[in-house]
């Protein structure tokens, strides 16, 4: 019961990481204009993986796509990377492990097979939360540079009245988001591999031992309860219980489309 | 179309209050911030500063904080600009403008003319 | 704030001529985002309201005639009037979009020569 519950929930906090990477990857906010020297901005700036956008005071919003795939930075093209291997993965990781739930029955698949299967899972959500993490963790890095660079670089070129001010970026929401989900990701991994020791058959068969009573011969097989029961490991028995799939609708919340800066 | 018809002119006497009326028609109140702007006698023009529509927060030039107050009546799609202790140099025109793409001044009210004589 | 300052004052210029004013701002314009130019200009006859004319430093508002045209980038912008009409005559007013407070020009007065 507790390797299903582990493995539920695993799948669970897996699903909602996952979702949450894609999320992250698809947002505009991944780097926002630093507001601190200027917080009443009339002309708000954000930018994310795939377009950067502009706010205007008067709640017109426009975006414009990095139409380049040469021009752009390596290490923004690596997040990208990152962060596609890491719903790719994640998403393979998904699908092999709906079939791995012990819930869920297709055919006579065997225990060793689901325990096989929810490794594998756990194996990818490991790694996709670490692409992830590791994608959100180049990006900020890549923004804290930028960021102490323009500070240093703030006014300079200021000659006689006219005054320079270069736009700063800092941490966009996107980076949080992607952080959590890639942690959640991470965690149901951990949790799946957990789930597969506990369904891994035990190796051990004890063999029948037979016991004489006079005039009787009874064979007494240890275990027999367990498996009327339908407890136990014995990987012969199959599963009477279906718990059936259970889906959750997920809701996303967007921006408002008037919102000003 | 767009319209924006501010109430008729005033004359007041120094220390009274008045209250300026912008009626919008032709679009959403809330959709678009309201600007106010001040021409005085023979000069040039003022930002004030706007009200945000979606909050109804209001922001004020340096020059403007204190003694005027910017509203907003959605109920009846009218933005309000009130002047308190009126002195002799408020005299002016006051328009009411919407702010649109570019945070340009797309729309105009007719402006206001508002006298402080004693 | 931005300190915008238009030269000249005062300009008369013949029917038909072109007619050229000068707005500086004190501080850049040009966003970074999306390379835009928060420069407005304004139009204002005796006795009305202004009226938008170009905004995005460049970018022709509907109904305007094309004989205006905005250009000018950073700090530096220019409205021209390509051939000037009788009904041109006006003051005309530029305008910081980019940062509060939102600050204008202190006018150009066009006249007919």
């Known amino acids: 019961m507790a390797v299903t519950a582990c493995q539920g929930l695993g799948f669970v906090v897996s699903l909602i990481g996952i979702a949450g990477i894609i999320a992250a990857t698809c947002m505009d906010q991944w780097s926002t204009q630093d507001l601190y020297n200027n917080p009443v901005t009339a002309v708000f700036n954000y930018q994310g993986l795939w377009r950067s956008c502009v706010r205007e005071s008067s709640g017109f919003t426009e975006c414009r796509g990095y139409f380049t795939l040469l021009g752009l930075p390596a290490m923004l093209q690596a997040v990208r990377a990152l962060m596609i291997v890491g719903i790719v993965l994640g998403a393979i990781g998904l699908l092999v492990s709906i079939f791995a739930l012990k819930c869920i029955r297709i055919g006579s698949m065997e225990d060793s097979a689901k325990a096989n299967m929810t490794l594998t899972s756990g194996i990818m959500f490991i790694v996709s939360g670490l692409c992830a993490i590791a994608g959100v963790s180049v990006f900020a890095n890549m923004l804290v540079t930028n960021f102490w660079m323009s500070t240093a670089n703030m006014y300079t070129g200021m000659g006689g009245m006219v005054q320079t001010v270069q736009t700063r970026y800092t941490f966009g929401a996107a980076l949080f988001v992607g952080w959590v989900a890639g942690g959640l990701t991470l965690i149901g991994g951990v949790m799946m591999c957990i789930a597969c020791r506990g369904l891994a058959p035990e190796e051990t068969n004890y063999k029948a031992v037979s016991y004489h009573a006079s005039g009787h011969s009874v064979a007494y097989k240890p275990g027999g309860f367990k498996a009327s029961t339908g407890f136990g490991s014995n990987t012969k028995n199959k599963k009477i219980y279906d718990g059936g799939a259970r889906t959750e609708d997920e809701v996303q919340s967007y921006p408002s489309k008037h919102d000003y800066v | 179309q767009v319209q924006l018809v501010q109430s008729g002119s005033e004359l007041k006497k120094p220390g009274a209050s008045v209250k300026v009326s912008c009626k919008a028609s032709?679009?959403?109140?809330?959709?678009?911030?309201m600007n106010w702007v001040r021409q005085a006698p023979g000069q040039g023009l003022e930002w004030m500063g706007w009200?945000?529509?979606?909050?109804?927060?209001?922001t004020y030039a340096e020059d403007f904080k204190g003694r005027f107050v910017f509203s907003l009546d959605t109920s009846v799609s009218t933005a309000y600009l009130q002047i308190c202790s009126l002195k002799a140099e408020d005299t002016a025109v006051y328009y009411c403008a919407r702010l649109y793409r570019g945070n340009t001044l797309d729309n105009w009210g007719q402006g206001t003319l508002v006298t402080v004589s004693s | 704030d931005i300190v915008m300052t238009q030269s000249p004052d005062s300009l008369a210029v013949s029917l038909g001529e072109r007619a050229t004013i000068n707005c500086k701002s004190s501080q850049n314009l040009l966003n970074s985002g999306n390379q835009r130019n928060y420069l407005t200009w304004y139009q204002q006859k005796p006795g009305q309201p202004p009226k938008l004319l170009i905004y995005?430093?460049?970018t022709r508002e509907s109904g305007v005639p094309d004989r205006f045209s905005g250009s000018g980038s950073g700090t530096d912008f220019t409205l021209t009037i390509s051939s000037l009409q009788a009904e041109d005559v006006a003051v005309y007013y530029c305008q910081n979009g980019y940062s509060f407070p939102f600050t204008f020009g202190q006018g150009t007065k066009l006249e007919i020569k």
């Open positions: 009200i945000r529509p979606n909050t109804g927060e209001p």
């Open positions: 032709g679009y959403t109140l809330t959709n678009y911030g």
């Open positions: 995005w430093a460049s």
